[in-house]
Interface confidence: low
């Protein structure tokens, strides 16, 4: 339905608080380097304008599109050229090209300092002094570091952030109350950002057909009692929501997400028995709860799939009449029966089924040709099952840190051209799959592990796209979304790689090492490990383990010394020489 003023429509639908929060997030995700105060000023100006349009929808400029209004506002920033360089050229374009231009300049790895958490008393005083500014600052800092963060979900995180401070700043032991909550929000926030980044990559790089296939599979697992038509409706609506958010249309996205939550809660009976407790909650919490809801129980009497998709003589006729609908139904039927499979595996099976039908429906005897199609699925199913089994065994044997190290070595050998910080970040996150998924019962391990790995590998893909250095990475990232993980798993030692020259500076350490947190120490050691593998890609596990054990002993020794810096200066070169000899 059309409105005379889009900005007035969204302001009335969302309310002032959510409107302002979403505009702040949108601006912070586009102009990631602008100071907080500049963004607040822009948001206030947009909000005042929106209020005039609410009062009189026919007032001047109220009929303009949101992209036009927001783009015009962003282009008033005085320092655009100095701060953003060629992004300023976007302002010479007309809509919709201007918005596309802004989207293309979103930076997945902005050069921003890591957020330092002040002391609890400092934060509590700031919270009490000016709660509104405090919460806006949170939205701004998260949004500029995560330019694809799912905006309505970020409002939910901000609400939880506010609740944490409201509760804990009154507590007797503020730190004991607050710090675990902030850690949880930080970790959940990073995971949420990475999951949304995969959705946006899926839409932007592979199109809405790819996203819809993912959504059919996932929603069919969650809502196995729902009819195909119901799942299709939810998929269509969900695709619209995520297309909008990934495209920077955050007001429309939040509004449509609220409508989708409303629809789901009004139609629980035909969707899932698990929605009830979500639907009693306030809007932000309700939408989050619906997105995270557990899988409903599978109907008890589901017939075998073979009857309709293998044994029927009408398979090719049904396929030819409406290919995407037929494949969608196949995916829905397979997924609702297999909550124990990863979404990516289900999509590979649908792809294999489609390829078989394409080949067989053109053959002399189609039925004979596709009769064994389900047998062809077996190796596709066994590959991730075996991968999860082997890696969980390795994780249980080594523990998280050493498991991460094993993955660091594995991935550095596969793609040594990738920058060391990226290899460390990605391998550390790949290694977290162990703690996250290996403790789960067998039926939940594969969906947890493989779908998590897809999210982490997408991070590698978006970072690599910014500065491409490896044809192998480009190939695995761009050829097929569903086969990314198997593609990376299949990579071997890169024989063409010319080992990196040894640089003693890379292996020179100082007394500051001793004051680092445990996590920071691990990152330092893992950075050194990647550099070692880049220098000696054919080093054996035993050689690398020996060097890393010596490294740990050397650091421990010097951190216990009275004159730490002198110890590092003296023992460091000895460690480097011994390492070179061990790897020669």
């Amino acid at each position: 339905d059309t409105h005379k003023s889009e900005v007035a429509h969204r302001f009335k639908d969302l309310g002032e608080e959510h409107f302002k929060g979403l505009v702040l997030v949108a601006f912070s995700q586009y102009l990631q380097q602008c100071p907080f105060e500049e963004h607040v000023k822009l948001v206030n100006e947009v909000t005042e304008f929106a209020k005039t349009c609410v009062a009189d929808e026919s007032a001047e400029n109220c009929d303009k599109s949101l992209h036009t209004l927001f783009g015009d506002k962003l282009c008033t920033v005085a320092t655009l050229r100095e701060t953003y360089g060629e992004m300023a050229d976007c302002c010479a374009k007309q809509e919709p090209e201007r918005n596309e231009c802004f989207l293309q300049h979103k930076d997945d790895n902005p050069n921003l300092p890591p957020l330092v958490r002040p002391e609890v008393d400092v934060m509590c005083t700031a919270f009490h002094d000016n709660e509104a500014t405090f919460l806006k600052k949170y939205l701004y800092e998260v949004a500029r570091r995560h330019p694809y963060f799912y905006a309505p979900e970020l409002l939910f995180f901000a609400a939880r952030y506010k609740a944490a401070f409201a509760e804990c700043c009154q507590a007797a032991d503020k730190a004991a109350c607050l710090l675990p909550k902030l850690d949880e929000l930080r970790d959940e926030g990073k995971a949420s950002s990475a999951k949304q980044r995969l959705k946006c990559a899926s839409l932007q790089k592979f199109g809405d057909r790819a996203f819809k296939a993912w959504a059919v599979a996932r929603l069919s697992q969650k809502f196995p009692k729902a009819e195909f038509a119901e799942v299709s409706k939810l998929v269509t609506d969900l695709t619209k929501v995520h297309t909008e958010c990934c495209h920077g249309d955050l007001l429309e996205c939040a509004d449509d997400r609220a409508d989708l939550a409303k629809y789901m809660c009004e139609n629980q009976d035909s969707i899932s028995s698990k929605l009830k407790e979500c639907c009693d909650k306030p809007l932000l919490e309700k939408s989050h709860c619906l997105a995270e809801v557990e899988n409903d129980e599978m109907p008890a009497d589901l017939p075998s799939l073979a009857a309709d998709y293998v044994e029927s003589k009408d398979v090719c006729k049904n396929y030819a009449e409406a290919k995407d609908v037929f494949l969608g139904m196949f995916l829905y039927e397979y997924a609702r029966r297999h909550p124990d499979y990863s979404v990516m595996l289900l999509l590979r099976l649908a792809k294999a089924y489609e390829a078989t039908l394409e080949k067989c429906c053109a053959a002399a005897d189609p039925h004979e040709c596709y009769a064994k199609v389900f047998d062809e699925f077996q190796p596709l199913v066994e590959e991730p099952q075996n991968l999860v089994k082997q890696n969980c065994e390795l994780f249980e044997q080594l523990g998280e840190y050493k498991f991460q190290n094993a993955l660091l070595v594995r991935y550095t050998k596969k793609v040594p051209q990738v920058s060391t910080p990226t290899l460390v970040e990605v391998s550390r996150n790949l290694g977290k799959v162990g703690a996250k998924c290996c403790k789960l019962p067998e039926a939940k391990r594969m969906p947890c592990a493989e779908d998590y790995l897809s999210v982490v590998l997408n991070r590698l893909c978006v970072l690599h796209e910014k500065t491409p250095v490896s044809e192998k990475v480009t190939k695995c990232c761009t050829e097929s979304l569903v086969n990314r993980r198997p593609c990376f798993s299949a990579l071997e030692l890169d024989e063409a790689y010319v080992p990196k020259a040894f640089n003693a500076e890379t292996f020179t350490f100082h007394a500051d090492m001793c004051t680092l947190s445990e996590k920071e120490k691990q990152v330092k050691k893992q950075t050194a490990l990647v550099e070692l593998v880049k220098h000696k890609p054919k080093a054996t596990k035993e050689q690398l383990k020996g060097v890393m054990d010596n490294f740990a002993a050397f650091v421990e020794k010097c951190c216990k010394a009275d004159d730490k810096e002198a110890c590092f200066a003296e023992e460091g070169p000895k460690f480097v020489a011994a390492s070179q000899a061990a790897l020669a």
Partner: nanobody, 115 residues
């Protein structure tokens, strides 16, 4: 970045007064809040006083009525006037500043209250 330099610490008798100064330099246009904290040996760092750009102030009960924070925006300096000093006020006093919370810190100045 913002650099903060404290001065004015020293030895004072119980009941005496002292005035601390903190000069800010660097990217000070973003500074909305300036504050004083203190840390006694073996103790947690403790909030002492805060002043916003507009001049609003707040203090914990332990110093209320004895300490006064003020700010000279033209000189980018914040002051802490400490009266009726007690032995338990002995500590290193730190100046802190920031846009929304105090994220920049000085090196500290020692205040010793002793007879």
């Amino acid at each position: 970045q913002v650099q903060l330099v404290e001065s004015g610490g020293g030895l004072v008798q119980p009941g005496g007064s002292l005035r601390l100064s903190c000069a800010a330099s660097g990217s000070i246009e973003s500074i909305n809040r300036m504050a004083w904290y203190r840390q006694a040996p073996g103790q947690q760092r403790e909030f002492v006083a805060r002043i916003s750009k507009g001049g609003s102030t707040n203090y914990p009960d332990s110093v209320k009525g004895r300490f006064t924070i003020s700010r000279d925006n033209a000189k980018n300096t914040v002051y802490l006037q400490m009266n009726s000093l007690r032995a338990e006020d002995t500590a290193v006093y730190y100046c802190a500043a920031g846009p929304v919370w105090e994220q920049f810190w000085g090196q500290g100045t020692l205040v010793t209250v002793s007879s």
